[in-house]
Amino acid sequence: HTAAQDNCTCPTNKMTVCSPDGPGGRCQCRALGSGMAVDCSTLTSKCLLLKARMSAPKNARTLVRPSEHALVDNDGLYDPDCDPEGRFKARQCNQTSVCWCVNSVGVRRTDKGDLSLRCDELVRTHHILIDLRHRPTAGAFNHSDLDAELRRLFRERYRLHPKFVAAVHYEQPTIQIELRQNTSQKAAGDVDIGDAAYYFERDIKGESLFQGRGGLDLRVRGEPLQVERTLIYYLDEIPPKFSMKRLTA
């Protein structure tokens, strides 16, 4: 009888089924929906999390202006195809044989087409801009305190290496967090910025993916930081390919 058998759960992903049937009675966890093995010492990939979610009953400013190529996830939830490593497959299709290409965070980056649509490679999202608006407070937060707290959050809660948090901008009430991670910078074992951003997004919405942990309680020098709006922009290493019709709509 082992400690694993007493507490066979996945700390980093509550959308799993776990059983103590691994080597030596160790806890082995699989993602809902895909049945894929999950590493509970780190974040689960966004693709497996979306799949599990679908299977569950259910001016001169310091602020950054998103590039013309920045993508926002307007398509909402879908049941994705994930590769054997849990990453998004470059081409996604729905049950009516409508297909489209996605980036590494699963956001559509082409017009929709049919089964003949080709997506030659999974294009990496190397820059994520998280745009938050906080609820009114007595005064503005101290920028350096806010910066330190958000960096600590990404380091400790999401296990994202500090070098991937490129900047934290603040102009009351807007906060922007920039995450940057090129293919060449990401080493084996590094948390992906797309996965960290997704966990953060779910935390902000009060839908934490962590097992048994309380929800996100963000405080800056003891003052609660309550977010009332979140927008996330995704920038890919190769610009997206949309027709002019969509761009002028």
Partner: nanobody
């Protein structure tokens, strides 16, 4: 990139034996823990056997204990599974996998395509 290629599967009669091999490349095999996992038709994946990086520690699922033996040859980057006293319920696709063991948890992170083992008279 990580590549795992299994071989040695086939049709065998109950009580018979097979030896599966898994050729590994694209990662430092001699410092990686490895496992065999299997998936029977219409069922979920099942962990079968585990061996640590230097081969000094092995584990077996209760269903195969005493019948299967896992081993490795780090000089050849190859993992083996010797399967004796085979039963009909051992019929499955067998995959080798790179594995990770902590004090409490176990996970596989890369798998081969698999080799089919059919036990039938």
């Amino acid at each position: 990139q990580v590549q795992l290629q299994e071989s040695g599967g086939g049709l065998v009669q109950p009580g018979g034996s097979l030896r599966l091999s898994c050729a590994a490349s694209g990662f430092p095999f001699s410092s990686a823990d490895m496992s065999w996992v299997r998936q029977a038709p219409g069922k979920g994946p099942e962990w079968v056997s585990y061996i640590n990086a230097d081969g000094s520690k092995t584990y077996y699922a209760d269903t195969v204990k005493g019948r299967f033996t896992i081993s490795r040859d780090n000089s050849k980057n190859t993992l083996y599974l010797q399967m004796n006293s085979l039963r009909a319920e051992d019929t499955a696709v067998y995959r080798c996998a790179r594995a990770k063991l902590t004090d409490t948890h176990y996970v596989e992170d890369y798998w081969g395509q698999g080799t089919m083992v059919t036990v039938s008279s």
